[in-house]
Structure formats: structure tokens, C-alpha cells
């Protein structure tokens, strides 16, 4: 049976916590990703940004989980208008920002 949206979001949050907690060396070798607008369509936008990071096992599970939240197919090189124009940040900072935002969505009951 499908996982309830609240459970799926909780699991995504916990996965992001694990990533930030287990950071020994720079996450994904310090790779940079496009910063995104966190106000709407956050799951697809986050996936569109992170999918361009390859060969980083630490975020592969996060990429798969975000894919489950995004209703359309996302491929590398694809960007929506939710990208913050010409602003790149390290994956580690991206994950931290995304984590805080998702915790707020969970509090507000926005599970989808």
C-alpha cells in the first residue's frame, strides 16, 4: 500500500538530517547546485537542482525520495522558473536550507 504523504515527508526530513549529520568531508566534493525559490513547487525544483549532481552516493536516496514527490519526470539540465537566477550554492548548504523549509511544511501540514 502507498506510504501516507506525512510519513513520506517525515522520512525525507530524516534522510536530510542523516546527510547533514554524517558530513565528514565536503558533501559531494563541494559540488555547486542552482539555488531555488522555496516558496512553491519545492520538491520538483529541488530535484531539478540536485539531479545535476552525479557520482555522489550521499544524496542518491534524497534524489529518489524527491522523485516520489514530484508529479512529472525530471532529467538533468532541466530547470523551472523556480530556480534563483544565476545563483549557485554548495550542496551542503542547499540540503540545510531545504531541510529547514521541509520541517516548516511538515509543521503546517503541507504533506504534498
Amino acid at each position: 500500500s502507498p506510504v501516507p504523504p506525512s510519513t513520506a515527508l517525515k522520512e525525507l526530513i530524516e534522510e536530510l538530517v542523516n546527510i547533514t549529520q554524517n558530513q565528514k568531508a565536503p558533501l559531494c566534493n563541494g559540488s555547486m547546485v542552482w539555488s531555488i525559490n522555496l516558496t512553491a513547487g519545492v520538491y520538483c525544483a529541488a530535484l531539478e537542482s540536485l539531479i545535476n549532481v552525479s557520482g555522489c552516493s550521499a544524496i542518491e536516496k534524497t534524489q529518489r525520495m524527491l522523485n516520489g514527490f514530484c508529479p512529472h519526470k525530471v532529467s538533468a539540465g532541466q530547470f523551472s522558473s523556480l530556480r534563483v537566477r544565476d545563483t549557485k550554492i554548495e550542496v551542503a548548504q542547499f540540503v540545510k536550507d531545504l531541510l529547514v523549509h521541509l520541517k516548516k511544511l511538515f509543521r503546517e501540514g503541507q504533506f504534498n
Epitope: 517525515k10 526530513i13 530524516e14 538530517v17 547533514t20 549529520q21 531541510l99 529547514v100 520541517k103 516548516k104 511538515f106 509543521r107 503546517e108 501540514g109
Partner: antibody
């Protein structure tokens, strides 16, 4: 200005009852979840319970569940804490505090009252 | 129920940086709030949602929350910062608000 004012504290014998009130002013009371927090002399803060903005839900700390009841009257901007079967360990300063109401009430308390002292003693 | 662990006391000299920790199982998955309480006064919110600061709180106060530890940092500590500090989270599983035991900050 925004304000919460508690009243109703005093000395009461074990096993008796007491009702505390919290009067809100300067903000839209009905849009906030309201909490009670207590602090025993020389001790830390202990959450007592919460009532949702519309009064539809209440949650209580295990230590007071079944003995304390939180109610609110949004037409009068008042919050109440009915305390029954009081115990010596209920002795504390009782604060009311507001928190913006979210689906799961995990919000910070951005406004507190000055507190009212409750002493349970024989 | 969810337990938050704080050191009972932290001491720091004026002008130095104070670090107060709040430990909890996967606390990084929760939004953490911090309060300052001076003797005989009601608590005051100093940090909310892990790292946000109310407008009236000086920039010297900051917060972080990673893994199993949330941290309140006070830079350039002043005598007026001497107080008890409490962390707080909402325990979703129990529908309870939880406070840490509090940390007494002493400015030497």
C-alpha cells in the same frame, strides 16, 4: 500593546481545586494557539498543555492529564486552566503563552504573561 | 517521551562566545526554539525555527540544528546576557511541547 495577564493564583490545600485565568489584549486572540507552562521554585520550565485557536483540540502533559482542563472564550479573549485534585508537586508559577496556530502546533511562544503563583500546601 | 538534554551551566568571560547545546534523538528533524529567562521574569524568545531571530534580539544570538544537537551561540557576551536558557521542541508523536532542563549562563 500586546499583553497576557494571568490571575487566580494563591494558596490551596492538596486535593482541592483552583482555576487560573489569562486575559489577552492587543492582538487577535482567536487566531493563536494558547499554552500553559509552569515553573516550580528553583526548577526549569514545564509545559502543561495547549488549546488550539478555535478550541477544537487540547493536549496535556502526562503529569496533569485527567486533572487539569484548558478552556478558552474567544469572544472574551480569555484562557482558563481548571486545576483539580491538586498536589504539592503542582506548586509553581503558571504562565500562559501564545503561539501562532499551525496544523501541528510546533510553534515558538512569542508572547508570555508575567505568571501567577500557585502554592499547594496543607 | 522525547527528552532534551542541556548542560546545567556554562561560564564565559565578557566579550567571549558562549555555546549552549541541546541534545535529542534526531533533533535535526525538529524545529528548535530557544528562550532566555532572567530571575523573576517571564521567558523571552531569542531564537525560533532553529536559527531565526525575533527582530528585537541582537545579531549576537544565533542558532543551529544538526543531527542530534541543536546549539545556541551568543557572541561577544555581555553581563546582561546572564540568564537561564531553555531549548524547546514539539514532540509530534506524543502531541507534547518539550523543554530542555535549562542552562544557567554565568558571565565571569
Amino acid at each position: 500593546q500586546m499583553q497576557l495577564v494571568e490571575s487566580g493564583g494563591g494558596v490551596v490545600q492538596p486535593g482541592r481545586s483552583l482555576t487560573l485565568s489569562c486575559a489577552a489584549s492587543g492582538f487577535e486572540f482567536r487566531t493563536y494557539g494558547m499554552h500553559w507552562v509552569r515553573q516550580a521554585p528553583g526548577k526549569g520550565l514545564e509545559w502543561v498543555g495547549v488549546i488550539w485557536d478555535d478550541g477544537s483540540n487540547t493536549h496535556y502533559a502526562d503529569s496533569v492529564k485527567g486533572r487539569f482542563t484548558i478552556t478558552r472564550d474567544n469572544s472574551k479573549n480569555t484562557l482558563n486552566l481548571q486545576m483539580n485534585s491538586l498536589r504539592v508537586e503542582d506548586t509553581a508559577v503558571y504562565y500562559c503563552a501564545r503561539a501562532p496556530q499551525w496544523y501541528l502546533t510546533a510553534e515558538a511562544f512569542d508572547l508570555w504573561g508575567q505568571g501567577t503563583m500557585v502554592t499547594v500546601s496543607s | 517521551s522525547y527528552i532534551l538534554t542541556q548542560p546545567p551551566s556554562v561560564s564565559v568571560a565578557p566579550g567571549e562566545t558562549a555555546t549552549i547545546t541541546c541534545g535529542g534523538n534526531l533533533i535535526g528533524a525538529k524545529l528548535v526554539h530557544w528562550y532566555q529567562q532572567k530571575p523573576g521574569q517571564a521567558p523571552v524568545l531569542v531564537i525560533y525555527d532553529d536559527s531565526d531571530r525575533p527582530s528585537r534580539i541582537p545579531e549576537r544570538f544565533s542558532g543551529s540544528n544538526i543531527g542530534n544537537t541543536a546549539t545556541l551561540t551568543i557572541e561577544d557576551v555581555e553581563a546582561g546576557d546572564e540568564a537561564d536558557y531553555y531549548c524547546q521542541v514539539w514532540d509530534y508523536s506524543a502531541n507534547h511541547m518539550v523543554f530542555g532542563g535549562g542552562t544557567k549562563l554565568t558571565v565571569l
